[in-house]
Amino acid sequence: APVRSLNCTLRDSQQKSLVMSGPYELKALHLQGQDMEQQVVFSMSFVQGEESNDKIPVALGLKEKNLYLSCVLKDDKPTLQLESVDPKNYPKKKMEKRFVFNKIEINNKLEFESAQFPNWYISTSQAENMPVFLGGTKGGQDITDFTMQFVSS
């Protein structure tokens, strides 16, 4: 069966939107009006993995682009990147672990934990116009809470 996907945008708990920053990076900043068109639309695919009531494994692709958020070790540190894939083969139900995030819902907020690196989360900074990254701390300076907005196909 084909993998189930939905289109959405994400905003952090400070209401910063996510936009492209160069070819293989995302950044977070406040957008208004027409600038909202800059925000990235994700194709969130529901993939195979450990699942529970509040934890759902997903892959985050960029809509109509052959790019997926992935988690890899760089300089011995878990790192978030945008990775190019062959569009003929993706998305698929059994995604490689580096592409998988545990979507965790807590108090109407979402966290995205790396399946490859437990306790590492998609993070943004309090600062404007700074990169989205994989952070190993929750509840500190870095923001790990997001809201999801559905986008019609």
């Epitope: 600062a127 404007e128 116009n129 701390t137 300076q141």
Partner: antibody
Framework: EVQLLESGGGLVQPGGSLRLSCAAS????????MFWVRQAPGKGLEWVSV????????RYADSVKGRFTISRDNSKNTLYLQMNSLRAEDTAVYYC???????????WGQGTLVTVSS | DIQMTQSPSSVSASVGDRLTIICRAS??????LAWYQQTPGNAPKLLIH???SLQSGVPSRFSGSGSGTDFTLTINSLQPEDFATYYC?????????FGGGTKVEIK
Amino acid sequence: EVQLLESGGGLVQPGGSLRLSCAASGFTFSKYWMFWVRQAPGKGLEWVSVISPSGGMTRYADSVKGRFTISRDNSKNTLYLQMNSLRAEDTAVYYCARVGYGGNSDYWGQGTLVTVSS
Amino acid sequence: DIQMTQSPSSVSASVGDRLTIICRASQDINRWLAWYQQTPGNAPKLLIHSATSLQSGVPSRFSGSGSGTDFTLTINSLQPEDFATYYCQQADSFPLTFGGGTKVEIK
């Protein structure tokens, strides 16, 4: 008053190592992204590295990737740059700078000179 | 990487002149541009951020304009302390990049 004070520069042979420090005061250091920027003698400015407030995210210029490491100790209000495998072309004044709104450098240190020569 | 091209690379001017420095980005950087002033032996000083916003404490004779790929720094009525080198810097994406600088000399 915001102050940034670099130290640790000096003369080093090619292939050698140095560790630069930047002592910050006059602001809540742990809330700010920080940069290292360098300037070769008589040349323009070159961005070297950035670190997030928690230290959770770092980035480097291609010219130093794999050789330089940025880090910070928020308990000591200090930023570091560990420089290994130094080359003649790394000779420059190294500035630490606080990141302001949207990615500019709103405050700079006075700089520390690193000379790589045999 | 985004290339930043400044022009002119040097210019001679007199006190009281109006001076315009141009900075071009190799791709759209929205308004994520800063301007700095550097005098010999000193660290750079932020003048303008977000293309048009004057940094606190900077005299109002400095102004910035532009968005996308083309930006200008204007100094109305040059003062003796304005003879320096000026740099633009894009903050749209990493690696951050600077223009090559514009040296403003006394005519």
